[in-house]
């Protein structure tokens, strides 16, 4: 007997996911069933059901499988958070891209390659056909959407509503071309789910028909989604498993982007004359090693065969036959001329004195013409001429191009914190430079700091769910978890984005991090229905000296009646002295047998130099602070509550106007608590959201 | 400057409770870490305390050994001694406010463990 | 857990000549690698940070290299007041660590 494909391959999965049917006319069928295995086959040859299918959920707890007709992007339809949901949807219908010659396309380009309207494949007029979708079952022949029924060579197609031109092809790209990589693909998180000679990928959470070591679980920040080519372990570029038996693995056709930059976290700052650290970076020409043997050229096998390619070390520089460290030894080397010896270090090349001078900038740094061109992280910044899309895509107004000349650290969009540059890497798309303020320079950066110029609340209104004020006024608080306790709170102020503290992180292993959202018990309990678990992927910190972190989770936060987010103010605002503010937290209470409950504590709004008074004077605030006391003595923010948030209400709507950090004291009675002032920090926080890539839910 | 004390002769089975009193150190910046040496060994780490007041223990130092802090101090407190536990005791300032590298320590202070 | 393996435990060195320490770790730090030196009855003093970073006051001699899970401290133009035993330490995380520090080597000088 033949055995039966394993179909679940098809399906991109969301783990804890469900869908949920606002339009009452969208058809569902379920069934008992053991394995979402089983859902994906009958969900593939549409065996029983009265639709075609799109998707499925399995729910693991009733052992259930639900089919839908829809998927997460129809209308009509929302998505859900659910402990005991796995939602998959069909790959073909969700892709905007086409393998081989298309036959499996099923996505909703509608218009062909010279821009014509497609007639519906249900309609005669104008041009009479026989591709009528009850001839074509499972070819999905629906409205007028491009397809290739027959599999034809030039891929997807359509009969056109131009009486003049019967048919023409569509222009949908091969997903081999859409898919693109840096280096070694190690940071690559593309959808390409088949090898280069076509193979279909098994799921990384799959041990059929390859047991494998790369379990998802095990490796969260690998990237190990569904069935799509990853390069978890260092080869030239990403692979999978294959659902071949007789093909263990094999490497997937991803090309190079065209902006080919390096792509690690660490990655070396580029020098030329001299050497950076292990001189990982170091781009120079010497070509002999240190006794002034010649080098072998790296992309030569003689006199010394090797693997250290240009092919299989694309970041690597390896041109000609310079001094190069591709693989993280001590300094520079190269394979040798001589045949006796095989390697040598090139030694001679001196050490660089890292010092910049006295690189300053005044006021945000808008008029700085350095020519510094690292970031502070000590990445190599990228030509602005490359990002200028990227650029334009977050400012509203024409840069000054004549500025933005070569790579250095510039300020074309008004930034408040000084010069910044794009880097070309895909996880840090751009980072501040290491300058600091001029001294002696007091230009501020926001003006009227204690005058309600500029409204804190946007127009909009409070959200409340359903009408009934739920635990949703408190749903943007989350609990970070250091090694599974609880260390600091945190506010979720966008799906994947978490405001909250520097300090917050003393580990730099992400794996010793969670998100808690949804609780209010700071241990979980009775909030099981309720609470979501999320990873951390990345932190982005904030400008120099503001204590801020955004936390980017690994997956989208689901927004439902226990998860939401907070507004952000406006940038520069101020809030009215003796506003009414409240802190959260699930920190240090002072009570001995503390329940762990959510607490809350009551401020008004301060004026920094009433605040300073009430500091006795030996503390300075300045714009980026803003001063709040507590209503009752001895109430406010203390160790546990740090990254949690201040939220004031204005205009009924509430904000995140604060962050708790330490260095202020624990609640010291008659000392108003100095926080973050998020305001001074708006433009940052919404640029990073802007300009970061997140998961896809 | 960070300087321990506390340290003396205990009996097996006792506990000891060493402080680090910090000046000019402030502890809303910088985690504090202990550290010890026994003689003719090698230097190991014990526990760390961090600015929001997260600790983290060696893991052969968990249940036994206790760090804590005051504005100006931070404790180690040791059980259940073993005749293991003689060594001269550190404190050592942790550059930042996370888990990094020491750019202070103090002279020490000598436990010795014994019947 | 990321444990340390300093190689090698003692090491014997002329004066003027050059010393080659190495710490090896379990998992990969980046560059999240110190260096002290300690002499008996002192306080451990730290020579080199972010695997590669001299510390203030600290002499050129001494030089860190390394990354991901092997380092190297090389101990250039050796003087007498360099005999001491030297740690590497990573500061990278210390979830389920047994000790931050490796096994030190000792440096004597000849």
């Known amino acids: 007997q033949r055995k039966r494909r394993n179909t679940i391959h098809e399906f991109k999965k969301s783990a804890k996911t469900t869908l949920i049917k606002i339009d009452p006319a969208l058809k569902i069928k379920t069934k008992k069933v053991n394995t979402a295995d089983q859902c994906a086959n009958r969900c593939t040859r549409n065996k029983g059901l009265p639709f075609t299918c799109k998707a499925f959920v399995f729910d693991k707890a009733r052992k259930q499988c639900l089919w839908f007709p829809f998927n997460s992007m129809s209308s009509g339809v929302k998505k859900e958070f659910g402990h005991e949901f796995d939602l998959y949807e069909n790959k073909d219908y969700i892709r905007n891209c086409i393998i081989g010659k298309g036959r499996s396309y099923k996505g909703t380009v509608s218009i062909t390659k010279s821009g014509i309207k497609c007639q519906p494949w249900s309609s005669m007029i104008p041009h009479e056909h026989s591709f009528l979708p009850s001839s074509y079952r499972g070819k999905d022949l629906q409205e007028n959407y491009c397809r290739n029924p027959r599999g034809e060579e030039g891929g997807p197609w359509c009969f056109t509503s131009n009486p003049e031109v019967r048919y023409e092809v569509c222009d949908i790209p091969q997903c081999s071309e859409v898919e693109c990589m840096t280096c070694n693909g190690e940071s690559y998180r593309g959808l390409m789910d088949h090898t280069e000679s076509g193979k279909i990928c098994q799921r990384w959470d799959h041990q059929t028909p390859h047991r494998h070591k790369f379990l998802p679980e095990r490796y969260p920040d690998k990237g190990f989604d569904d069935n799509y080519c990853r390069n978890p372990d260092g080869q030239p570029r990403p692979w999978c498993y294959t659902l071949d038996p007789h093909t263990r693995w094999e490497y997937c056709a991803i090309k190079t982007c065209a902006d080919n930059t390096m792509n690690d976290t660490d990655v070396p700052l580029e020098t030329t004359e001299c050497i950076q650290g292990q001189g990982e970076g170091y781009r120079g020409t010497v070509n002999t090693i240190w006794n002034g043997i010649p080098c072998q050229r790296w992309d030569s096998q003689y006199p010394h065969e090797h693997d250290m390619t240009p092919e299989n070390f694309k970041c690597k520089d390896l041109r000609e036959n310079y001094c190069r460290n591709p693989d993280g030894s001590e300094s520079p080397w190269c394979f040798t001329t001589d045949p006796n010896i095989r390697v040598g270090y090139c030694s001679q090349i001196p050490n660089c004195d890292m010092s910049h001078g006295q690189d300053c900038y005044r006021g945000n740094g808008k008029n700085y013409m350095g020519n510094l061109s690292q970031t502070r992280s000590g990445l190599t910044c990228s030509m602005w001429d490359k990002n200028m899309e990227d650029l334009h895509r977050h400012i509203f107004w024409e840069p000054d191009a004549s500025k933005l000349n070569e790579n250095y650290c510039r300020n074309p969009d008004d930034d408040a914190h000084g010069p910044w540059c794009y880097t070309g890497n895909p996880l840090i798309p751009w980072d501040y430079c290491p300058i600091s303020r001029c001294e002696g320079d007091t230009t501020p950066t926001i003006v009227n700091l204690d005058h309600p110029v500029i409204s804190c609340a946007k127009t909009k209104q409070l959200r409340v769910v359903n009408g009934i004020p739920t635990r949703t006024n408190i749903g943007w608080m989350v609990s970070l978890r250091y090694r599974n306790k609880h260390i600091c709170g945190g506010s979720l102020i966008k799906e994947s984005w978490v405001l909250t503290a520097r300090q917050c992180f003393p580990s730099r292993d992400l794996k010793d991090y969670e998100a808690w959202l949804g609780i209010h018990d700071v241990h979980g309990r009775g909030d099981e229905k309720c609470k979501q678990v999320l990873n951390v992927s990345q932190l982005v910190y904030g400008p120099e000296g503001s204590d801020l972190v955004l936390m980017k989770l690994a997956r989208p936060a689901v927004l439902d009646d226990f998860v939401s987010t907070i507004d952000l103010p406006n940038y520069g605002c101020t809030i009215p002295e003796k506003t009414s503010c409240s802190v959260y937290g699930w920190g240090y209470t002072g009570l001995i047998n503390y329940d762990g409950l959510l607490r809350v504590a009551h401020l008004y709004i301060m004026g920094n130099e009433k605040c300073s008074q009430h500091h006795r004077g030996k503390v300075t605030l300045n714009e980026s602070e803003i001063c709040a006391g507590a209503e009752k003595i001895g109430s406010g923010p203390c160790e546990g509550d740090y990254g949690g948030p201040l939220v004031c209400e204005q205009h009924k709507m509430r904000m995140v106007l604060g962050v708790i950090v330490p260095g202020r004291g624990c609640a010291i009675p008659n000392r108003p608590g100095i926080f973050v002032r998020v305001a001074y920090y708006a433009k940052w926080i919404h640029k990073i959201i802007l300009t970061y890539k997140v998961p896809q839910s | 400057s960070l300087e321990e004390s506390g340290g003396r002769l205990v009996t097996p089975g006792g506990s000891l409770t060493l402080t680090c009193t910090v000046s000019?150190?402030?502890?809303?910046?910088?985690?504090i870490s202990w550290v010890r040496q026994a003689p003719e060994k090698g230097l190991e780490w014990i526990a760390v305390?961090?600015?929001?007041?997260a600790t983290d223990y060696a893991s052969w130092a968990k249940g036994r050994f206790t760090i804590s802090r005051t504005s100006t101090t931070v404790d180690l407190k040791m059980t259940s001694l073993t005749t293991e536990d003689t060594a001269t005791y550190f404190c050592?300032?942790?550059?930042?406010?996370?888990?990094?590298?020491?750019?202070?320590w103090g002279p020490g202070t000598l436990v010795t463990v014994s019947s | 857990a990321y444990d340390m393996t300093q190689t090698p435990a003692s090491v014997e060195v002329a004066v003027g000549g050059t010393v080659t320490i190495k710490c090896q770790v379990s998992?990969?730090?980046?560059?999240?690698l110190s260096w002290y030196q300690k002499k008996p009855g002192q306080r451990p003093k730290l020579l080199i940070y972010?695997?590669?970073t001299l510390a203030s006051g600290v002499s050129s001699r001494f030089k860190g290299s390394g990354s991901g899970t092997e380092f190297t401290l090389t101990i250039s133009g050796v003087e007498c007041a360099d005999a001491a035993t030297y740690y590497c330490?990573?500061?990278?995380?210390?979830?389920?660590?047994?000790?931050?520090f490796g096994g030190g080597t000792e440096v004597v000088v000849k």
């Open positions: 050592a300032r942790v550059y930042d406010s996370g888990w990094n590298h020491f750019n202070l």
């Open positions: 000019g150190i402030d502890l809303s910046s910088n985690a």
């Open positions: 305390i961090y600015v929001v007041g």
């Open positions: 998992q990969s730090i980046s560059s999240w």
């Open positions: 972010r695997a590669s």
């Open positions: 330490q990573q500061a990278y995380s210390v979830s389920n660590v047994d000790n931050a």
